[in-house]
Interface confidence: medium
């Protein structure tokens, strides 16, 4: 599939609009601090160069790899050393080491200002004045804050973003039309970014085999009527797509994703009965729809798994012949029968099966040794079932905010060394599992909850990796991808932790809290809660609840006062003193 000019090939395949958008995303994900105008200039230069290669593939430099072309362009940025420090050293390297170096410097938590949403009229004016710049700015701002965002999917978000402004800037009540759409895009975007971050972590930290196993399980649940060979083909192609995107090869990734969507739609009869509507949509919507499509119905009368994977006398011979294919088939057969299991549970079962075969196929009587392997699955299945049952009961009893607070306390006690903003962010997201998943019937709860928790815990892992402070977090994050959640669940209070010194400033609040949104006010209170636990890790639930109730009453009282600032100063001192007494600080 060799082309004289790779850049010309991708430009022709993707078209100018998508080519420019993807190059902008790629550059913004690499150089996250660069101003918008600088990136636009670089993108325009690359685009003009690509056009010369389309006109003549033999033209000078057109035969260079995309990494070489893009890397050379990034390395022309004048302020590279001042802005990025040691990342500038990447430019002294040759490909492929230079690209690897850029990848290693991607920052999951870049020091960028929070995106503040302007007034609706201001946004609509900007949209009408220069639609192209407005949309590019959206791509740039998302890409630099989410350096692993799935690039072809970001094009889909940008298309929806444009549609929202096109529709709502003409509406009678612009704000009522636009704001809910922007909120939805923001929330979906954060979720999409976190899901993709887990895919990239899976590939980069645990390797292609781990990603392929995840994909076999998920696609087998989604397409239970497809046969194993079909699932294998999809897994191979999907792995290529995500490897490319996670590796910064965004043009190849988008191109291959389009090819995969085309293949799936051309072969939907042998894949799934649920794809018809997706396949009638335009490309970006089609790919998104396929990625989110509901599970197909399970074929009727699937035979027992035991016959082929336990009772057969050929189990060890088949396993020895092609271990990964045999395990892949086991995973496929198990997953297509269990849409009610989380992917990570299915992977734990497959790992247990593999470990058993490794041990038993070397034993004197292999069959006798592995005959009871399915019995070992029972506790593995019951553990997440029980955990979800308990936590959904707690969520229904407390509601989302207080459920988040319970998790904040739980996780701060487990890993108190982790920074307060990270604990707040991760615990808030963990707490969202309640409203996201507990409403589902039993059969859908586990795949919803445990696979969502894997995504959230990966956020903790990637943030912690940047500045490691806890051996326990490192251990849970690195030992096993599929056992991360059970590892964190099993952590008890960290008895080695030395409580943080009390600092009154941490608990000093001002009148500005009154003008915050409900969400931001919650974050302030939850930040204080984490700090309390760090000061007093042995505080009981009751003690913490009493202090938090007092705190809520204090904020409410002072926000109603005529002289808010004086109220916060005077009542705040009293609250701190009372809290110290209540907690024995």
């Amino acid at each position: 599939d060799a082309h004289k000019s790779e850049v010309a090939h991708r430009f022709k395949d993707l078209g100018e609009e998508n080519f420019k958008a993807l190059v902008l995303i790629a550059f913004a994900q690499y150089l996250q601090q660069c101003p918008f105008e600088d990136h636009v200039k670089l993108v325009n230069e690359v685009t003009e160069f690509a056009k010369t290669c389309v006109a003549d593939e033999s033209a000078e430099n057109c035969d260079k790899s995309l990494h070489t072309l893009f890397g050379d362009k990034l390395c022309t940025v004048a302020t590279l050393r001042e802005t990025y420090g040691e990342m500038a050293d990447c430019c002294a390297k040759q490909e492929p080491e230079r690209n690897e170096c850029f990848l290693q410097h991607k920052d999951d938590n870049p020091n960028l200002p929070r995106l503040v949403r302007p007034e609706v009229d201001v946004m609509c004016t900007a949209f009408h004045d220069n639609e192209e710049t407005f949309l590019k700015k959206y791509l740039y701002e998302i890409a630099r804050r989410h350096p692993y965002f799935y690039a072809p999917e970001l094009l889909f978000f940008a298309k929806r973003y444009k549609a929202a402004f096109t529709e709502c800037c003409q509406a009678a009540d612009k704000a009522a039309c636009l704001l809910p759409k922007l909120d939805e895009l923001r929330d979906e975007g954060k979720a999409s970014s976190a899901k993709q971050r887990l895919k990239c972590a899976s590939l980069q930290k645990f390797g292609e085999r781990a990603f392929k196993a995840w994909a076999v399980a998920r696609l087998s649940q989604r397409f239970p009527k497809a046969e194993f060979a079909e699932v294998s083909k999809l897994v191979t192609d999907l792995t290529k797509v995500h490897t490319e995107c996670c590796h910064g090869d965004l043009l190849e990734c988008a191109d291959d994703r389009a090819d995969l969507a085309k293949y799936i739609c051309e072969n939907q009869d042998s894949i799934s009965s649920k794809l018809k509507e997706c396949c009638e949509k335009p490309l970006l919507e089609k790919s998104h729809c396929i990625a989110e499509v509901e599970n197909d119905e399970m074929p009727a009368d699937l035979p027992s798994l035991a016959a082929d994977f336990v009772e057969s006398k050929d189990v060890c011979k088949n396993y020895a012949e092609a271990k990964d294919v045999f395990l892949g088939m086991f995973l496929y057969e198990y997953a297509r029968r269990h849409p009610d299991y989380s992917v990570v549970l299915l992977l734990r079962l497959a790992k247990t099966y593999e470990t058993t075969l490794e041990k038993c196929c070397a034993a004197a009587d292999p069959h006798e040794c592995y005959a009871k392997v399915f019995d070992e699955f029972k506790p593995l299945v019951e553990e997440p079932q029980n955990l979800i049952k308990q936590n959904c009961e707690l969520f229904e009893q407390l509601g989302e905010y207080k459920f988040q607070n319970a998790l904040l306390v739980r996780y701060t006690k487990k890993v108190p060394q982790v920074s307060t903003p990270t604990l707040v962010e991760v615990s808030r997201n963990l707490g969202k599992v309640g409203s996201k998943c507990c409403k589902h019937p039993e059969a859908k709860r586990m795949p919803c909850a445990e696979d969502y928790l894997s995504v959230v815990l990966n956020q903790l892992c990637v943030l912690h990796e940047k500045t490691p402070v806890s051996d326990r977090v490192t251990k849970c994050c690195t030992e096993s991808l599929v056992n991360r959640r059970p590892c964190f669940s099993a952590l008890e209070v960290d008895e080695t932790y030395v409580p943080k010194e009390f600092n009154a400033e941490t608990f000093t609040f001002h009148a500005d809290i009154c003008t915050l949104s409900e969400k931001e006010r919650q974050i302030k209170k939850q930040t204080a809660l984490v700090e309390l636990v760090k000061h007093k890790p042995k505080a009981t639930k009751e003690q913490l609840k009493a202090v938090m109730d007092d705190f809520a009453a204090f904020v409410e009282k002072c926000c109603k006062a005529d002289d808010k600032e004086t109220c916060f100063a005077e009542e705040g001192k009293k609250l701190v003193a009372a809290s110290q007494a209540a907690l024995g600080l």
Epitope: E227, F228, A229, S232, K233, T236, P303, D308, S312, D314, K317, N318, Y319, A320, E321, A322, V325, F326, G328, M329
Partner: nanobody, 125 residues
Framework: EVQLVESGGGLVQAGGSLRLSCTAS????????MGWFRQAPGKEREFVAA?????????DYADSVKGRFTISRDNAKNTVYLQMNGLKPEDTAVYVC?????????????????WGQGTQVTVSS
């Protein structure tokens, strides 16, 4: 789709031998049970031989060919073979290769998803 292409058929004298080959287009060939069926003019399609997935340790034959025909597979080449010795005029038929991922091995035609075009075997007396 899995494409199956048979080869090796031809005209042979009674008592002679032929080796049929069937090559599959799929990477996951190893996960398929493979079978040979045959259809003589004016007759129903009948089962000849089958071999299990993966190592191909389990084989099965129609009573009429037992001891004369041998089925084998080479996973590296995505190919299944049917070695036919002691051929008889009643073995004359179109021999068709089939692939199934429904079961580890099967002698039932309804459990096979994919079929080749077939190769003609003629045994003269």
């Amino acid at each position: 789709e899995v494409q199956l292409v048979e080869s090796g058929g031809g005209l042979v004298q009674a008592g002679g031998s032929l080796r049929l080959s069937c090559t599959a287009s799929r990477r996951a060939f190893i996960g398929y049970a493979m079978g040979w069926f045959r259809q003589a003019p004016g007759k129903e399609r009948e089962f000849v031989a089958a071999i299990s997935w993966f190592a191909g340790d389990t084989t099965d034959y129609a009573d009429s060919v037992k001891g004369r025909f041998t089925i084998s597979r080479d996973n590296a080449k995505n190919t299944v073979y049917l070695q036919m010795n002691g051929l008889k005029p009643e073995d004359t038929a179109v021999y068709v290769c089939a692939a199934s991922s429904a079961r580890p091995m099967s002698g039932r035609s309804d459990e096979y998803h994919y079929w080749g075009q077939g190769t003609q075997v003629t045994v003269s007396s």
